[in-house]
Amino acid sequence: TIDTKRNISAEEGGSVILQCHFSSDTAEVTQVDWKQQDQLLAIYSVDLGWHVASVFSDRVVPGPSLGLTFQSLTMNDTGEYFCTYHTYPGGIYKGRIFLKVQESS
């Protein structure tokens, strides 16, 4: 199963950690995909490492763990984020996070 904070908020110009936690007694994670709505943010492969989409490469840093640190947030970053865990055996598990970017006070 995937465990995540459903709703998170952060300040404009700040940073936020996008994190999904996968728990299973039998399945191993082989790949994790991160998307902002339908746009690819990053892919983690156990065998190949991290690929961060070039459009986000100056603002997205892998980690901690299989999560992402999203920096220099703008109001346009508000929206849904999806993690997809590919596991073997066990199949695919998805998690959803809604990020609200608030104006800095």
Epitope: V46, G49, P62
Partner: antibody
Framework: EVQLVESGGGLVQPGRSLRLSCAAS????????MHWVRQAPGKGLEWVSG????????GYADSVKGRFTISRDNAKNSLYLQMNSLRAEDTALYYC????????????WGQGTMVTVSS | DIQLTQSPSSVSASVGDRVTITCRAS??????LAWYQQKPGKAPKLLIY???SLQSGVPSRFSGSGSGTDFTLTISSLQPEDFATYYC?????????FGGGTKVEIK
């Protein structure tokens, strides 16, 4: 004995294509990611491409992206590199390599196959 | 892409010397760094993976350390068979990248 044997290299004109093969033996090929690494004459090592055990994830060096395609056939214990639109700067010795499980260090290498791109 | 800068590019040393080669990454790569030895006309040989894990069969005079952006390969007592070129390689980010190499020559 764990072994990787590359083939398919040769002399080719710029703009043409070539397909390299790597035959694996002595280990369960389908359990491992596999990689291609090249070395131009007198130069250093350059990672070219990698592919996961099930072809689910693939990576390429920027210098070959859009021109080279890595693939594998686990039933045939074989790794391939389809090279299109070849350039003089692709001239190199091409190695296939296998990683240490879960480490991403490449512990088994073939002897290499030479690709020369020249008119 | 991650740039790996090795230094020195070459080093002259004698048998028995302690040799240290450094590899600096342009961004943090955790401990996803490997070291290879290559001799002329031969395929590279894996020495160290995971920054500090010694590959099976590699002599204990080779050691690796570091994490993040700064890494070191140390040969504690150089042997005649150690004269070769050494490369670091990162595997945290795609595309994987190699350092430019360090040639260890006989003084």
């Amino acid at each position: 004995e764990v072994q990787l044997v590359e083939s398919g290299g040769g002399l080719v004109q710029p703009g043409r294509s070539l397909r390299l093969s790597c035959a694996a033996s002595g280990f369960t090929f389908g359990d491992y990611a596999m990689h291609w690494v090249r070395q131009a004459p007198g130069k250093g090592l350059e990672w070219v491409s990698g592919i996961t055990w099930n072809s689910g994830s693939i990576g390429y060096a920027d210098s070959v992206k859009g021109r080279f395609t890595i693939s594998r056939d686990n039933a045939k214990n074989s790794l391939y590199l389809q090279m299109n639109s070849l350039r003089a700067e692709d001239t190199a010795l091409y190695y296939c390599a296998k990683p240490v499980p879960k480490s991403r260090g490449l512990d088994v290498w073939g002897q290499g196959t030479m690709v020369t791109v020249s008119s | 892409d991650i740039q790996l800068t090795q230094s020195p590019s070459s080093v002259s040393a004698s048998v028995g010397d302690r040799v240290t080669i450094t590899c600096r990454a342009s961004q943090g790569i955790s401990s996803w760094l490997a070291w290879y030895q290559q001799k002329p006309g031969k395929a590279p040989k894996l020495l160290i993976y995971g920054a500090s894990s010694l590959q099976s069969g590699v002599p204990s005079r080779f050691s690796g350390s570091g994490s993040g952006t700064d890494f070191t390969l140390t040969i504690s007592s150089l042997q005649p068979e150690d004269f070769a070129t050494y490369y670091c390689q990162q595997a945290f980010y795609l595309p994987w990248t190699f350092g430019g190499g360090t040639k260890v020559e006989i003084k």
